[in-house]
Structure formats: structure tokens, C-alpha cells
């Protein structure tokens, strides 16, 4: 049951990080003060408990929730267009690659989709960035902030993603 | 909660083309497709094609390459359907639909159609 | 590609009664998706069910969704005068995305 996740993804994966260091438009140093720790659920990444589909579930919904936070209006306002568009391109193709494989992991089983917990928590880690840049005002700082949050998150799930690649 | 808003009702000359808006509000996302349903009077729905507004990538149904295009602007949310070579079995009410980002997992959200506009009729006659 | 045959075409009950709707494909469909829509008269679709089996927002929990490969069904336990109304099933296929819907089943007042 295995699926073409392996080449596509990581490779885009790769390109994801590359863009978002291109998106950094002032310096870390200048925003220390703003730091924040958004607590990244990285017991959801491991990969121990999961089965292929809930692991492809949970990483599904850490991209989307990425392409949903950089899609806003503010979003817009504050970075390079051009790089935005890159970065949206990496995340939709990150997308399909996931929905593809999930579409060949269930075929017409009734392999459970997902921990509802763990989709839940990702969410919530979500939620508190949308909520941090709400606080402050969406401002040049805060976006820095959450442009590396972000980075860190895409680097610290891969681990999931290499274990999806073994896992057959 | 997104609210999607069609323009009005419009009647067509067989050949011609028509031009069909849909406005989304709400919490919106340009990462969620927009979809184009339509509906024959007395009949079924029928998917037409989608666009990822973010991106302006689309998909179309077989049956209406060719003659169908959907493009969309990032702001205001906008999605536009355009159909051509119009013939009157076209005549139809013309839906716009779009998923939700509550749905859990994301990964089944773009699969379905939480959210529907109000419809725009769209009449073929000669 | 797939097509969704509903059945029956018409249904005539009385409320209180309960009635069961069929969807058919005619090649195996995961139940993850599979939806069910609601649709009256003069009105926009209504998304009912999702992932073969989960209720969306505010729909009443005498609505229910079942079944798995080819064979999915749509149970109202006791309708009540609001649930007469035409019902889609739509499965979805990817890639390309492909969404596909049923003729419907139309609910009737006996």
C-alpha cells in the first residue's frame, strides 16, 4: 500500500524551507523581544503510534492550516508576493502529494482517517499563532516570529515524514 | 461561518457566452477551492470544475472542456464562472460552493461542500 | 469514472416514520468520501453527512450515514415535517479531483 510520497515530498518539503528563509525581510535580532513559544505538539510528529493514514491526516493538516495562516489579507500585506506564490505552490503540491497517497492508503477499507486528539492539538498550536498575531497587531515583528515558527515546525515534522517513507 | 453571494439572473442567446460572480465572505480562505455546481430545472447537481483562488489553479469536468473557464481575484474573495458556446440544455440554476476549515481532518474538507451560494439562473432561450 | 446510483427514486412516508436511502457506485468508493446533501425546494444543497458516517454542523442526529465499497445508505430514525426534501449522495476522486453526484432521492409526504 505504499504511495509515491517519498521523491515529491521531501523535495518539496525542502523548497518550502528554502522559500520561507527568502521571506525573512528583518533581522531575528531586532525581534527577541517579541519571541513567543507557540508549543509545537512534537509528540504528534514522531510517528510512533500512527498508522500511515492518521500520520498522513496529521501532517495534511499542518500544511493546510500553514497555507491558511500565509493566505490572508495580512498575510499578503507583509510578504513578497512572488515568494508568497512560491511558498503557496510548495504547500498545494505538498497537498496533493498527501491527498494522492491517502486516496491509495484507504482504497475501500475502513482504515481510521485520523486521532482526533492529534488533529485537534495541531489545530489548537494553530490557533495560538492566529491568536499571537492578533495581539500584535499583525505587525512586521510578529510575522518574523511566526515566519520561524513556521520553519521550525516544517523541520521538526519531517521526522513523521521519513518514517511515512519507511513505513510500508 | 462563509457566505458566498452570486450575481443575478441572466438570459442568453444560444452560441453566446455568460459570465457568473461569486462573492465569498466570512471566514474565508484563498488555500480553500471554489466550485461551480450547476442544476437543470427538475434535474440533479452537477460538478463543473473548481478553482484555488490563491493560486488561480482549476480543474474542469470532462463534459464542459472546452467551453467552461473559472478564474477568481484574492481580494475581495471572488470566484467567476465562465460558460461558452451556450446551448439551451445549459439552461440551469448555476451554484457556487466552497468546503469549510472546521472540517476534521482537513484532509476530508475539500472533498465535499459545506458552504452554497444562493444560485443564479441562468436562462437559454432564443 | 464513477457514477452514484440512488435508489428509490421517490419515497412516500408518513412523519414518524423512518426511511432508509440507498447510493450505489459502480466501482469501489472509500466511505471517508462519501457525502450526503439535503436539498428543498427553491433552496441551495445542504451538506447533511461527510466521511460516510459524521454529521456536520447542526444536523440532528436522526439523520445517519452508513455502509462501505459500493454499497452506502442514508437513515432518517423519525421524520419529522422539515426532512421532506430531495437527497444527493456525492463521492469524491482524486487526482485529478473529480466530484461526482447522484441522481437523488426524492421524500414525499404520503
Known amino acids: 500500500l505504499g504511495c509515491d510520497l517519498p521523491q515529491t515530498h521531501s523535495l518539496s518539503n525542502r523548497r518550502t524551507l528554502m522559500i520561507m528563509a527568502q521571506m525573512g525581510r528583518i533581522s531575528p535580532f531586532s525581534c527577541l523581544k517579541d519571541r513567543h513559544d507557540f508549543g509545537f505538539p512534537q509528540e504528534e510528529f514522531d510517528g510512533n503510534q500512527f498508522q500511515k493514514a492518521q500520520a498522513i491526516s496529521v501532517l495534511h493538516e499542518m500544511i493546510q492550516q500553514t497555507f491558511n495562516l500565509f493566505s490572508t489579507k495580512d498575510s499578503s500585506a507583509t510578504w513578497d508576493e512572488t515568494l508568497l506564490d512560491k511558498f503557496y505552490t510548495e504547500l498545494y503540491q505538498q497537498l496533493n502529494d498527501l491527498e494522492a497517497c491517502m486516496m491509495q492508503e484507504v482504497g475501500v477499507e475502513d482504515t481510521p482517517l485520523m486521532n482526533v486528539d492529534s488533529i485537534l492539538t495541531v489545530r489548537k498550536y494553530f490557533q495560538r499563532i492566529t491568536l499571537y498575531l492578533t495581539e500584535k497587531k499583525y505587525s512586521p515583528c510578529a510575522w518574523e516570529v511566526v515566519r520561524a515558527e513556521i520553519m521550525r515546525s516544517f523541520s521538526l515534522s519531517a521526522n513523521l515524514q521519513e518514517r511515512l517513507r519507511r513505513k510500508e | 461561518e462563509v457566505q458566498l453571494l452570486e450575481s443575478g439572473a441572466e438570459v442568453k442567446r444560444p452560441g453566446s457566452s455568460v459570465r457568473v460572480s461569486c462573492r465569498a465572505s466570512g471566514d474565508t480562505f484563498s488555500s480553500y477551492p471554489i466550485s461551480w455546481v450547476r442544476q437543470a430545472p427538475g434535474q440533479g447537481l452537477e460538478w463543473m470544475g473548481r478553482?484555488?483562488?490563491?493560486?488561480?489553479?482549476?480543474n474542469y469536468a470532462q463534459n464542459f472542456r472546452g467551453r467552461i473557464t473559472i478564474t477568481a481575484d484574492k481580494s475581495p474573495l471572488t470566484a467567476y464562472l465562465e460558460l461558452s458556446s451556450l446551448r439551451f440544455e445549459d439552461t440551469a440554476v448555476y451554484y457556487c460552493?466552497?468546503?469549510?476549515?472546521?472540517?476534521?481532518?482537513?484532509?476530508?474538507?475539500?472533498?465535499?461542500?459545506?458552504?452554497w451560494g444562493q444560485g443564479s439562473l441562468v436562462t437559454v432561450s432564443s | 469514472e464513477i457514477v452514484l446510483t440512488q435508489s428509490p427514486g421517490t419515497l412516500s412516508l408518513s412523519p414518524g416514520e423512518g426511511a432508509t436511502l440507498s447510493c450505489r457506485a459502480s466501482?469501489?468508493?472509500?466511505?471517508?468520501?462519501l457525502t450526503w446533501y439535503q436539498q428543498k425546494p427553491g433552496q441551495s444543497p445542504r451538506l447533511l453527512i461527510y466521511?460516510?458516517?459524521s454529521r456536520a454542523t447542526g444536523v440532528p442526529d436522526r439523520f445517519s450515514g452508513g455502509g462501505s465499497g459500493t454499497d452506502f445508505t442514508l437513515t432518517i430514525s423519525r421524520l419529522e415535517p422539515e426532512d421532506f426534501a430531495v437527497f444527493y449522495c456525492?463521492?469524491?476522486?482524486?487526482?485529478?479531483?473529480?466530484?461526482?453526484f447522484g441522481q437523488g432521492t426524492k421524500v414525499e409526504i404520503k
Open positions: 466521511g460516510g458516517s
Open positions: 460552493a466552497s468546503p469549510s476549515a472546521d472540517i476534521i481532518p482537513s484532509i476530508l474538507g475539500t472533498t465535499l461542500f459545506a458552504f
Open positions: 456525492q463521492s469524491y476522486h482524486s487526482p485529478p479531483p473529480v466530484y461526482t
Open positions: 478553482i484555488l483562488p490563491a493560486l488561480g489553479v482549476t
Open positions: 466501482q469501489n468508493v472509500s466511505r471517508h468520501y
